[in-house]
Amino acid sequence: QQAPYWTHPQRMEKKLHAVPAGNTVKFRCPAAGNPTPTIRWLKDGQAFHGENRIGGIRLRHQHWSLVMESVVPSDRGTYTCLVENAVGSIRYNYLLDVLERSPHRPILQAGLPANTTAVVGSDVELLCKVYSDAQPHIQWLKHIVINGSSFGADGFPYVQVLKTADINSSEVEVLYLRNVSAEDAGEYTCLAGNSIGLSYQSAWLTVLPEEDPTWTAAAPEARYTD
């Protein structure tokens, strides 16, 4: 016989769930034990069956999960999974916050990425700071030339995707360029998108030859200019 234990505690690390109103929330407490434990859910310390909730709830005992669709502000609270068998019991608390802010297209911090001058062989970091209510999807793009032209027949620039990432709100996204060469010079764009729309800002990277006399041994590897 064995008291209940969490089988995937790494999946339970996200304690605070702050989600926009209308989204679906899923809490999981995967567990095991001998005999096989049962799972119950509490909301703010009281037994929770979802009877008073528009749309109800979905309890999937074989997945150790609680699912609530189209969450509203009244769903805010502390949700506790209580897992027990004849030998013992364990519990875990999730905090749910329902956000009612108006989601907006991503906002990029002014001045980032910044125009940068670097010497051949040095390393460069381009920064992009994104503010977004909805989780933003970030892309770093390099503007490229095709058949001698920077623009297509439609008048829009040719771009190459260098990096793609999904980040949390207010994180700094960084594009690392190692051992830069003259070919790395050009225009770089940080593009952030969410469910409302896209925002993007660009910067220029200038790459100077190694023997450029304006660079001294004491100079930093990359210089940021306006």
Partner: antibody, heavy 124, light 112 residues
Framework: EVQLLESGGGVVQPGRSLRLSCAAS????????MHWVRQAPGKGLEWVAV????????YYADSVKGRFTISRDNSKNTLSLQMNSLRVEDTAIYYC?????????????????WGQGTMVTVSS | DIVMTQTPLSLSVTPGQPASISCTSS???????????VYWYVQKSGQPPQLLIY???NRFSGVPDRFSGSGSRTDFTLKISRVEAEDVGVYYC?????????FGGGTKVEIK
């Protein structure tokens, strides 16, 4: 050709449910946010809901929050709107609209492609 | 929510003459990226809305150059330099900067 085709409209009694679908073709559906917009007979346009490209984020107009659920199946290029607890004031043509895509926008970043709409009538 | 107020309610124009529709937003639509997120649509009878102008002043592909958009922050204008019979319909402005996305009440354009 880029196309959006709505279906599932009809006449329903107040308090009942209806599920609308929108079939997308001619573009990479899984790379775009998608919206529903409605228009009551003889009235203006009202935004209803949006879902992100991967379905992880959803937002709703206050008038439908808690009653309508937007969802998508990227494997089938389909957008859905589950409408519960329908009210007379939900009577409208419902349009499926393409939102912002992933990647550098060669033109507007969404709200450029609309379906023909499907009519929902809520009446007792 | 951002309120979009459109004027006039209706407009009767002689073919070949100019027409102008105004739209005012309750908050600035100028975004941190320097773009102004106001869109203009026309809706012809029995059809869905069609995009005319995006990001304040950019003409959508296939839109005749007699249509132009202008303005700044909270005050926007759609101009038709020479109205043609096919321009009949209801014109809407829309803000595309935050949810809920909101539309103006519409301006009905008819031919004299």
């Amino acid at each position: 050709e880029v196309q959006l085709l709505e279906s599932g409209g009809g006449v329903v009694q107040p308090g009942r449910s209806l599920r609308l679908s929108c079939a997308a073709s001619g573009f990479t559906f899984s790379s775009y946010a998608m919206h529903w917009v409605r228009q009551a007979p003889g009235k203006g346009l009202e935004w209803v809901a949006v879902i992100s490209y991967d379905g992880s984020n959803k937002y709703y107009a206050d008038s439908v929050k808690g009653r309508f659920t937007i969802s998508r199946d990227n494997s089938k290029n389909t957008l859905s709107l589950q409408m519960n607890s329908l009210r007379v004031e939900d009577t409208a043509i419902y349009y499926c609209v393409r939102g912002a895509g992933l990647g550098y926008p060669n033109g507007p970043d969404g709200f450029d492609i609309w379906g023909q709409g499907t009519m929902v009538t809520v009446s007792s | 929510d951002i309120v979009m107020t459109q004027t006039p309610l209706s407009l009767s124009v002689t073919p070949g003459q100019p027409a102008s529709i105004s739209c005012t937003s309750s908050r600035s639509l100028l975004h941190s990226d320097g773009k102004t997120y106001v869109y203009w649509y026309v809706q012809k009878s029995g059809q869905p809305p069609q995009l005319l102008i995006y990001e304040l002043s950019n003409r959508f592909s296939g839109v005749p150059d007699r249509f132009s958009g202008s303005g700044s922050r909270t005050d926007f204008t759609l101009k038709i330099s020479r109205v043609e019979a096919e321009d009949v319909g209801v014109y809407y402005c829309m803000q595309y900067i935050e949810a809920p996305l909101t539309f103006g009440g519409g301006t009905k354009v008819e031919i004299k």
